[in-house]
């Protein structure tokens, strides 16, 4: 299976490193410093 | 309250097959992947099978890959362990399990945080 | 592949003594700075049941006087004060992301 965070969740975090999450068939972001949500914004 | 209840155990010979089912409860049953851990007789945990939420993705060890293959229907909280080719080191009792998890700043932290009671599988001729 | 492997294989303690069973994985089980080690308590005739999960974290409803420590490779579930109720086989688990997700073989606890 292709990884999301490389095709239409490659702009989704903002200020952080998308990653996903297998298990749960999701994706989140691992923020940079200072930002916090979903989408580190 | 969650509940795991495993059936379709039971006596097979070398080479047979047969289907487990879990039925789920009390809990959104598509919101967590799913895992099949045996026991055999006297011995200690080995993880079988895990599914993800969607069944899009699928995970085995090396002793059963290509022999049994894990599935769920989420619109009947169920989740299958279809095990073909049987020998006799599959006999145990077979746990289905709920992966429970954190994921908080982009980790992932999981665990199996409810058991059923087990059904056993004997592979006897 | 990472092998978990557990010692003692089998432990006497008595009530009220301190019992602490060790789990030693062949690579690293960490991710910056997070540990993906769980332990498991079977007592007979019964389904595993979590105690700790990401190495220290008491599972809900767990009594206090479990306790789990360690990273990287070396952890240890300690019980403070051994109950009889505490007899049972207990397990460690990792849990990082790649797959097979082993078990170590377990270790029987005992009242001495």
């Known amino acids: 299976k292709k990884n999301p965070c490389n095709a239409e969740f490659q702009n989704f975090c903002i200020h952080g490193e998308c990653k996903y999450i297998e298990h749960l068939e999701a994706v989140t972001c691992k923020c940079q410093q200072e930002y916090f949500g979903e989408r580190c914004g | 309250e969650v509940q795991l209840v495993e059936s379709g155990g039971g006596l097979v010979k070398p080479g047979g097959s047969l289907r487990l089912s879990c039925a789920a409860s009390?809990?959104?049953?598509?919101?967590?992947?799913m895992s099949w851990v045996r026991q055999a007789p006297g011995k200690g945990l080995e993880w079988v099978s895990t599914i993800s939420t969607g069944g899009s993705h699928t995970y085995y060890p090396e002793s059963v890959k290509g022999r049994f293959t894990i599935s769920r229907d989420n619109a009947k909280n169920s989740l299958y362990l279809q095990m073909n080719s049987l020998r006799a080191e599959d006999t145990a009792v077979y746990y289905c399990?709920?992966?429970?998890?954190?994921?908080?700043?982009?980790?992932?932290?999981?665990?199996?945080?409810?058991w059923g009671q087990g059904t056993l599988v004997t592979v006897s001729s | 592949d990472i092998v978990m492997t557990q010692s003692p294989d089998s432990l006497a303690v008595s009530l009220g003594e301190r019992a602490t069973i060790n789990c030693k994985s062949s690579?690293?089980?960490?991710?910056?700075?997070?540990?993906?080690l769980n332990w498991y308590q079977q007592k007979p005739g019964q389904p595993p049941k979590l105690l700790i999960y990401?190495?220290?974290n008491r599972e809900s409803g767990v009594p206090d006087r479990f306790s789990g420590s360690g990273s990287g490779t070396d952890f240890t579930l300690t019980i403070s004060s051994l109950q009889a109720e505490d007899v049972a086989v207990y397990y460690c688990?990792?849990?990082?992301?790649?797959?097979?997700?082993?078990f170590g073989q377990g270790t029987k606890l005992e009242i001495k």
């Open positions: 690579q690293s089980v960490d991710y910056e700075g997070h540990s993906f």
């Open positions: 009390g809990f959104t049953f598509s919101s967590y992947a």
């Open positions: 399990a709920r992966h429970g998890y954190l994921l908080y700043e982009g980790y992932y932290e999981w665990y199996f945080d409810y």
């Open positions: 990401a190495a220290s």
């Open positions: 688990q990792q849990s990082t992301e790649n797959p097979p997700y082993t």
